[in-house]
């Protein structure tokens, strides 16, 4: 499935913690690009092997 | 997926207006956000809140202090409670399935009218 | 809370027409802008979401537009069983909120 990517509505500006929230369109669900240093499903978590 | 609302069709004013949806041919764990809305007499369309496939809820700040979502995973069933119910709460109460910005499966509805 | 107007309630057209219903927000949605269907028995059905995307099994006959605050969901060639009533949602801010509905009826 090749899903679109938007930003964010305003309801989920916060949703991640250390990165930008994208909005997949299709599947009407929110995602995360995580900033350096960051992983999770929510750029939760620091990336000890960064 | 289907949705299936049942409960009560008659409350009293000021007592507790409950309601099931029970879903089938989707686990409501499993992902998006199980919602009520209400339809006034008239047409109007009310989000009342939701619950989502991880338990937690969100609720519209018009009926914070009214009501209550909850599940019963076992039965992939999801309850509204609605507190001290006066006649403005008499609606037409949907189940619906949604994301995080719309309603893509909604139950069939069940009227509700609140009078002594 | 965003307030969403249908100014229209109500709408009449001939089968085969082309028609336009309009929804507006009391303020930038973002395209986050969805259209739903009610047939007469209660039905509800979602049409049309993220402004103009057409949901699944929904006919082409369907379409939407819209940015900021003013959208509009177009039905052309209609058909019988197109006779429901229409309703925008804004899913940009929670609470999410609802237009009133605009009905259509036959000539």
């Known amino acids: 499935v090749v899903s679109h990517f938007n930003d964010c509505p305003d309801s989920h500006t916060q949703f991640c913690f250390h990165g930008t929230c994208r909005f997949l369109v299709q599947e009407d669900k929110p995602a995360c690009v995580c900033a350096s240093g960051y992983v999770g499903a929510r750029c939760e978590h620091a990336d000890l092997l960064a | 997926v289907q949705l299936q609302e049942s409960g009560p069709g008659l409350v009293k004013p000021s007592q507790s207006l409950s309601l099931t949806c029970t879903v089938t041919g989707y686990s409501i764990t499993s992902d998006y956000a199980w919602n009520w809305i209400r339809q006034f007499p008239g047409n109007k369309l009310e989000w009342m809140g939701y619950i989502s496939y991880s338990g937690s809820t969100s609720y519209n700040p018009s009926l914070k202090s009214r009501i209550s979502i909850t599940r019963d995973t076992s039965k992939n069933q999801f309850f509204l409670q609605l507190n001290s119910v006066t006649t403005e709460d008499t609606a037409t109460y949907y189940c619906?399935?949604?994301?995080?910005?719309?309603?893509?499966?909604w139950g069939q509805g069940t009227l509700v009218t609140v009078s002594a | 809370d965003i307030q969403m107007t249908q100014t229209t309630s109500s709408l009449s057209a001939s089968l085969g027409d082309r028609l336009t219903i309009s929804c507006r927000a009391s303020q930038d949605i973002r395209n986050y802008l969805n259209w739903y269907q009610q047939k007469p028995d209660g039905t509800v059905k979602l049409l049309i979401y993220?402004?103009?995307r057409l949901h699944s099994g929904v006919p082409s006959r369907f379409s939407g537009s819209g940015s900021g605050t003013d959208y509009s969901l177009t039905i052309s060639n209609l058909e019988q069983e197109d006779i429901a009533t229409y309703f925008c949602q804004q899913g940009n801010t929670l609470p999410w909120t609802f237009g009133g509905g605009t009905k259509l009826e036959i000539k």
């Open positions: 993220y402004t103009s």
């Open positions: 619906a399935r949604g994301g995080i910005t719309r309603f893509a499966y």
